[in-house]
């Protein structure tokens, strides 16, 4: 699944949490809450697709309650009365317990899966496209809530236009209730058209024989550092790469580095002894030339925390720090299929990584 | 190329442990949910546990609540399912199965398409 | 536990002949439905996912389709190489979450 025209994630949100949906709800898209159940306070947490922040009209009110054995409600609220309650009487969450959260929207039905099984399906009893906000409550924490469209990348390499004019940049770190839309790349005064050459193929025997290669997301926070992990598929245009971590107290530099083979592709590595953010290109051990310039103040803090959203496009990776967009840098490896390896080390607790 | 390679099967006497390994290359375990699928001699399929791992979530079939445990390791990309207090019915061979669940196309999409090539377990005095 | 009930158990058929396995679900499972074609001492291997969709590298002459709660898995044209034992699987979210069809074994008339 292609990020192209995606909304970027809502980080570590504060929970009562209700958030915008850009062009609301679309048939195909699939929205994903990842978190933890509380294990101390409160019996229940609520996801709710609604119409506007006031709570009155809520399409779907997906509604875990560790109550009596533990079952899930969902439910549709017009105009401030409820309807009919729809219970599901298996609970796939556990208290203490992380989560992953999934939710389809399809023209007859929301579908939800929870850690990777399909759970409950439920038919509209409203139109969808009057959602415009999903909110969260209850006893919960919330690591991210992240946003998939549903374009993907076609099958056989091809020459197609993509707009790259929606945002594609993290939002704003979250202050309060209500989480205001996520930036945009800076763009040229009009709106971006690319054409992107698609190269990607899946392997011999892939289950899905589409390059569009599903986000894959790692568990917190068992991250062992130096932490390697594959990028399925490699990098193609519309590729997004998703990190958050905290810089040790007493950090002197760490990297990420996109590999390819014994090439690193793109080495990313900030320094603090330095006050730098360095970029680089290794080639067969030789390093190219440097990158260093900045539009602004180092990004990176010791003891903060940071996100770093890598956004591949045909020419270039863009790199925005904490939702601002910081620098492009233009390929030197230009195979991006061959790009599969993510390497991150160094001074840094890395808190979430999405490939 | 992805794989999964099951072992630590063999011959163990009833109310005896075993721990079974899947060692999966070409994936992350931490980004699909692995399960366990038995087929005991001249029988069908018997969905035994799953783990997804990038949560830590867990299920078993009922016949093996409480005997068995299924657990991830993810820096070494490997599964495991111990298996206690083990009966005669457990006989089988074991395979563990990468299943799939994502979105392509405006749908979901859902089956196990990689599977190790098995291991067997034999419960017998 | 949501039940998938497979039939029949065996038939036996000739090469070319057009043959259809059936499941039914105990209640909805949605299209989390695959199917599965299994050779003696071999590990299953997925043939359709998602109730109708073609796995990789499947031949098209193996087809899926979803009725309300039952599903079939059709082969067209049957070759020498489909002679084998074949399962329905649901994902549906239950006290067990997976759950397989008994098997349909394809015999040589």
């Known amino acids: 699944m292609a990020f192209s025209g995606s909304q970027a994630p809502y980080l570590s949100p504060a929970v009562p949490f209700s958030g915008t949906i850009q062009g609301g709800l679309q048939d195909g898209l699939q929205i994903t809450v990842n978190g933890t159940v509380l294990s101390s306070s409160g019996t229940r947490f609520a996801v709710n697709f609604q119409t506007g922040f006031s709570g009155n009209d809520i399409a779907f009110h997906f509604n875990p309650r560790f109550e009596d054995g533990g079952y899930v409600v969902c439910n549709t609220r017009q105009n401030g009365s409820w309807g009919p309650e729809e219970r599901k009487t298996h609970m796939p969450f556990q208290k203490g317990m992380p989560f992953d959260l999934c939710f389809l929207v399809q023209s007859s039905d929301f579908k939800v899966m929870v850690n990777g099984i399909l759970f409950v399906q439920y038919f509209h009893r409203v139109p969808f496209h009057r959602v415009d906000t999903i909110s969260v409550n209850g006893s919960v924490q919330l690591s991210y809530i992240s946003f998939q469209n549903p374009r993907t990348v076609p099958v056989q390499p091809a020459f197609s236009t993509v707009p790259f004019s929606q945002p594609v940049c993290f939002p704003p770190r979250p202050r309060g209730r209500r989480q205001k839309p996520p930036g945009v790349w800076p763009a040229n005064p009009a709106p971006i058209t690319q054409t992107v050459i698609h190269t990607v193929q899946s392997a011999p025997g892939q289950m899905f024989s589409t390059p569009a290669i599903p986000p894959m997301m790692y568990p917190h926070p068992a991250y062992p550092m130096p932490f390697i992990t594959t990028i399925l598929g490699g990098l193609y245009p519309s590729k997004s790469i998703l990190l958050s971590g905290t810089v040790l107290p007493s950090a002197q530099r760490f990297h990420i580095n996109l590999c390819s083979g014994n090439h690193i592709a793109f080495h990313l590595n900030p320094r603090f002894d330095e006050n730098a953010v360095v970029r680089n290109t290794q080639i067969d051990n030789s390093w190219g030339s440097e990158e260093r310039s900045l539009p602004r103040k180092m990004p990176f803090v010791r003891g903060q925390s940071f996100s770093v959203w890598i956004l591949c496009e045909a020419h270039c990776l863009k790199v925005a720090v904490d939702g601002q967009h910081l620098f492009e840098y233009y390929h030197r490896l230009r195979n991006l299929p061959t790009i599969n390896r993510l390497e991150v080390g160094g001074d840094i607790q890395l808190t979430h990584v999405q490939t | 190329e992805v794989q999964l390679v099951e072992s630590g099967g063999g011959l163990v006497q009833p109310g005896g442990s075993l721990r079974l390994s899947c060692a999966a290359s070409?994936?992350?375990?931490?980004?699909?949910?692995i399960h366990w699928v038995r087929q005991a001699p001249g029988k069908g399929l018997e969905w035994v546990a799953y783990i997804y791992p990038y949560s830590g979530y867990t299920s078993y079939a009922d016949s093996v609540k409480g005997r068995f445990t299924i657990s991830a390791d993810t820096s070494k990309n490997t599964a495991y399912l111990q298996m206690n207090s083990l009966r005669a019915e457990d006989t089988a061979v074991y395979y563990c199965?990468?299943?799939?669940?994502?979105?392509?196309?405006?749908?979901?999409?859902?089956?196990?398409?990689?599977w190790g090539q098995g291991t067997l377990v034999t419960v017998s005095s | 536990d949501i039940q998938m009930t497979q039939s029949p158990s065996s038939l036996s058929a000739s090469v070319g002949d057009r043959v259809t396995i059936t499941c039914r679900a105990s209640?909805?499972?949605?299209?989390?439905v695959a199917w599965y074609q299994q050779k003696p001492g071999k590990a299953p291997k997925l043939l359709i996912y998602s109730a109708s969709s073609l796995y990789s590298g499947v031949p098209s002459r193996f087809s899926g389709s979803r009725s309300g709660t039952d599903f079939t898995l059709t082969i067209s044209s049957l070759q020498p190489e489909d002679f084998a034992t074949y399962y329905c699987?649901?994902?549906?979210?239950?006290?067990?979450?997976?759950?397989f069809g008994q098997g349909t074994k394809v015999e040589i008339k």
């Open positions: 699987q649901q994902s549906y979210y239950d006290s067990n979450p997976i759950t």
């Open positions: 070409g994936f992350t375990v931490s980004s699909s949910s």
């Open positions: 199965a990468r299943y799939s669940t994502y979105s392509s196309s405006s749908k979901w999409v859902w089956g196990m398409d990689y």
């Open positions: 209640q909805s499972v949605s299209s989390a």
